[in-house]
Interface confidence: medium
């Protein structure tokens, strides 16, 4: 039997099913419009109404603002005409989409108002090492409610060369196993890159002096992150775990990464960042237990136990 | 590091207007806004108002509506205050500084100092 | 507009000597949100553009000198200087950023004996 589609659109009936929605967290800068996203599907059409911690939020009746909301949708912009204006919208907010047949809620989306990132004004003095030994140039970006991505970099916009010896860590300081004359450079700079904000700071250039020696003394391995000899750590199932081994020591030691507690998952591991790094994703259950980092060379080793707790995200 | 270039002195007669600029450097321009303050020899601090560079949109204090009109050319990563009919009231140094909506004003220009003479 | 009332309008002290000089506002400059007082103190020196010591009533900017404090919520606010340097003389404002437009109480003219 073959139903007239007009037939079918007058006669069956849909609930309310968000078929779209902001993601939970949002972080809204200084100079940005704020854009709140909820879309739905439903028969008869769906009726929306948003909340902001709890209580009802009508994004018309907001003074001092002009407001976009798009016809036949829950999503609505709102244009900042001020400097300020951010900071007045931050909270939690929850889309519902209505008809007859029931209500569908969004996920809360929680808004964030932040400052444009700056560096705070410091005073960078000279780094001054004997050739051979290890150095850590630090980086320190500033706080970021939005992740950031950190490059090292010199005056000519030229990315720091990393190998085994200089290293980038995930903190987004640079780490030397050990220095040689040709590091020697007034321009060492991190430039922090904040894609909500589309902005790229750099700190004050660091001034690596390194003084030459007759001999280099060999040195065996110390971790110079993390610097205990064992950490705890909580990953989420389902989520990426990140671990990291960074060593100095001359000659520059190499990173290896063991599990006593049972077998390598090798076909979710990956190892980056010349070995210095072990990548698992998608965490499981199984994944819980002990991952060992063992920094060697010629003159003996240092090892760094991490204890990894599987929950449920 | 962050840095706004204001030049140092302009004398205009008075009726006539003025366009005072603030050259910015150092950081992302369009991600701050930019703020503009007067102060009359011997006296305090006047908020005249503020631009997005993002996108042109401007607040200003009502004192000012009608004296002053903000401006920015983002390719020069410049911002200006045009400030028209001036009188003796206008002489005054005219500041730019950075405000991001969050730290308050912490990054200032040195200054231009505006006389109006005949 | 929200009106900023400082006092004294001047004060002389010597050096080592500590300093308080009061802000009032007409309204509160609490931010419900987020907790924070929208309120800044500025230092300007002779000759000089003010420069950021405090935000946010008590925050103190990088670089200032840990003898500058600020304190207060609401209406009520207060600059301390702890122990006065020579070069602390300048002039001190406290502004207020919570409501437009942004206002500047009439400054505390700082002297030394």
């Known amino acids: 039997i073959q139903i007239p589609e007009e037939y079918e659109g007058h006669h069956v009936m849909e609930p309310p099913v968000i078929t779209e929605q902001s993601p939970r967290r949002l972080v809204v800068f200084p100079t940005d419009d704020i854009s709140l996203k909820c879309e739905a599907s439903g028969k008869p059409e769906v009726q929306f109404r948003w909340t902001r911690d709890g209580v009802h939020f009508k994004p018309k009746e907001e003074l001092g603002v002009t407001v976009y909301q798009s016809p036949h949708s829950g999503s609505f912009t709102i244009t900042g005409n001020n400097s300020n204006f951010a900071q007045r919208f931050q909270g939690i907010y929850r889309c519902f989409a209505s008809n007859k047949l029931g209500t569908a809620m969004s996920h809360e989306i929680r808004l964030m108002a932040e400052g444009a990132p700056k560096w705070p004004k410091e005073t960078v003095k000279p780094v001054e090492v004997e050739e051979g030994e290890s150095v850590v140039l630090p980086c320190n970006p500033p706080p970021s409610a939005e992740p950031l991505r950190i490059y090292w970099m010199n005056s000519k916009i030229l990315h720091i060369k990393q190998d085994e010896r200089v290293t980038m860590g995930q903190n987004g300081n640079l780490y030397f196993a050990n220095v040689l004359t040709s590091d020697n450079h007034s321009d060492y700079i991190c430039h922090a890159h904040f894609p909500g904000t589309r902005t790229i700071i750099q700190k004050e250039p660091i001034d690596l002096r390194v003084k030459a020696t007759n001999s280099m003394i060999d040195r065996k391995p110390r971790l110079l992150f993390p610097t205990n000899s064992s950490s705890h750590l909580v990953a989420l199932q389902g989520q990426p775990l990140v671990l990291e081994c960074i060593a100095e020591g001359f000659p520059t030691p190499t990173i290896k990464w063991l599990r006593p507690s049972g077998p390598m998952p090798a076909d979710r591991v990956t190892y980056q960042n010349h070995n210095k790094t072990l990548q698992l994703l998608k965490v499981g259950e199984e994944d819980d237990g002990e991952y060992r980092c063992l920094a060697e060379n010629s003159l003996g080793s240092a090892r760094h136990a991490y204890y990894v707790t599987v929950e449920a995200a | 590091q962050v840095q706004l270039q204001q030049p140092g002195d302009e004398l205009v007669k008075p009726g006539a207007s003025v366009k005072l600029s603030c050259k910015a450097s150092?950081?992302?321009?369009?991600?701050?806004?930019m703020q503009w303050v007067k102060q009359r020899p011997g006296q305090g601090l006047e908020w005249i108002g503020e631009i997005n560079p993002s996108n042109g949109r401007t607040n200003y204090n009502e004192m000012f509506k009608s004296k002053a009109t903000l401006t920015v050319d983002k390719s020069s990563s410049t911002a200006y205050m045009q400030l028209s009919s001036l009188t003796s009231e206008d002489s005054a140094v005219y500041y730019c500084?950075?405000?991001?909506?969050?730290?308050?004003?912490?990054?200032w220009g040195q200054g231009t100092s505006v006389t109006v003479s005949s | 507009d929200i009106v900023m009332s400082q006092s004294p309008s001047s004060l002389a002290v010597s050096v080592g000597e500590k300093v308080t000089m009061s802000c009032k506002s007409s309204?509160?400059?609490?931010?419900?949100?987020?907790?924070?007082?929208?309120l800044a103190w500025y230092q300007q020196k002779p000759g000089q553009s003010p420069k950021l010591l405090i935000y946010w009533a008590s925050t103190r900017e990088s670089g200032v000198p840990d003898r500058f404090t600020g304190s207060g919520s609401g209406t009520d606010f207060t600059l301390t200087i702890s122990s006065v340097k020579a070069e602390d003389l300048a002039l001190y404002y406290c502004q207020q950023y919570h409501s437009y437009p942004f206002t500047f109480g009439s400054g505390t003219k700082l002297e030394i004996k």
């Open positions: 150092g950081y992302t321009f369009t991600s701050y806004w």
């Open positions: 309204q509160s400059l609490l931010y419900s949100s987020n907790q924070k007082n929208y």
């Open positions: 500084a950075l405000y991001d909506g969050y730290y308050a004003m912490d990054y």
